[in-house]
């Protein structure tokens, strides 16, 4: 039990896309503030978002230190204006988050088709290699840098005049597909991590079609 009028946080939820990771919780504070702590299973607790009236805390900087680690967070509740006050057990009221392993659980962000180029009856489609907030040697890593061959892209492609979607896959960021000469095609890509059992797929990229600005056509 906590100090009068202080309630414990609840519904602690991790929201994470391409490793940008925010912890959210309820309730909206009334006469109370929150502080968040995060730790790996074997590590020390680190405090973040001190005495905030927000109900979210950006923990990206902590989890990108090692995205394969499993993290636990906890949200402490304090009476507003009296943050030294503790619960009856001599400790502030707090609630634990579910465990979170970024590498296995971060959502894959919507990919973008960077370009496509037709050469005769072949089309090369390139997917943008999105930058993440994961750093190595002071440089930000791309999604491909982080996931390597665990990440594949599925390309859906179809004739502008038809509805059936053919598929192709790659564990790089490029596709080379066969197309019928004289036909315009549309493309959409999806990021997939097949080794996962949940959060396996991204939403689809925006559709790009031949005859629009992104592409290039070369007759050979």
């Amino acid at each position: 039990s906590g100090t009068t009028n202080t309630v414990a946080a609840y519904n602690l939820t991790w929201k994470s896309t391409n490793f940008k990771t925010i912890l959210e919780w309820e309730p909206k504070p009334v006469n109370q503030v929150y502080t968040v702590q995060i730790s790996t299973k074997s590590g020390d607790w680190k405090s973040k978002c001190f005495y905030t009236t927000d109900t979210e805390c950006d923990l990206t900087d902590e989890i990108v230190k090692d995205v394969k680690q499993t993290y636990l967070a906890r949200v402490f509740s304090y009476p507003a204006g009296n943050v030294e006050s503790t619960g009856s057990a001599g400790e502030p009221l707090y609630e634990n988050s579910p465990e979170f392993t970024p590498y296995l659980e971060t959502n894959l962000g919507q990919p973008t088709i960077q370009s496509f180029e037709q050469v005769g009856t072949k089309v090369n489609v390139t997917v943008e290699d999105e930058r993440t907030l994961v750093r190595r040697n002071n440089t930000f890593l791309s999604l491909r840098d982080v996931f390597g061959k665990d990440l594949i892209y599925t390309l859906y492609y179809w004739k502008s005049s038809s509805s059936g979607k053919k598929t192709a896959k790659t564990n790089t960021n490029e596709f080379l597909i066969d197309v019928d000469k004289g036909e315009n095609y549309c493309f959409s890509v999806q990021a997939v991590i097949p080794s996962r059992t949940v959060n396996r797929k991204s939403t689809d990229s925006p559709v790009e079609c031949m005859g629009q600005e992104k592409g290039e056509f070369r007759e050979i």
Partner: antibody
Amino acid sequence: EVQLVESGGGLVQPGGSLRLSCAASGFTISDYIIHWVRQAPGKGLEWVGYIDPSNGYTYYADSVKGRFTISADTSKNTAYLQMNSLRAEDTAVYYCARDDQSLSSPFDYWGQGTLVTVSS
Amino acid sequence: DIQMTQSPSSLSASVGDRVTITCRASQDVNTAVAWYQQKPGKAPKLLIYSASFLYSGVPSRFSGSRSGTDFTLTISSLQPEDFATYYCQQHYTTPPTFGQGTKVEIK
């Protein structure tokens, strides 16, 4: 435990319609691709079509294009095969299968199959 | 569409025999080939994926290999439960296509 269970098969007259269901459990269909594959009596496996339930994208074999429609209800975790203008040559056991969407996309889980007989 | 030509269509063998089944793709399919086993009245079961990777729970007597557009399923020492029909499948491009099947019978 991952499971796919087909239902809805039966005897139908030529020109008739039938809707098959593929109920999935142990996984979420929108995380995968679902295929329909059929096998005529004493014959080999023939791919019918697929759906990606996350976006509704489909593709069909030429032999069923315009007659068969694959759909999915993600709230029920179920895929469907609507078969119209049925012909005698559509008589087969119909299987749904899960595609793990890896580079080689094997069909890692299959249902037990449901028999469709088209006969007058 | 890519054709998968499977041979032989049937073979007779004894328990303990080494059995080889081949599939030839009509064009490049990289390693996007799977092998399935099917017993009468049952659904196919995945044995090999990506041409040479053994699927979880499949006995190690099964193996797969690739040489260009030729793919091989080998059973190193045939067991009584291996008498079945085997299918190759490519999923390099849509539509995915199956081989005609190879029925492995008891000699």
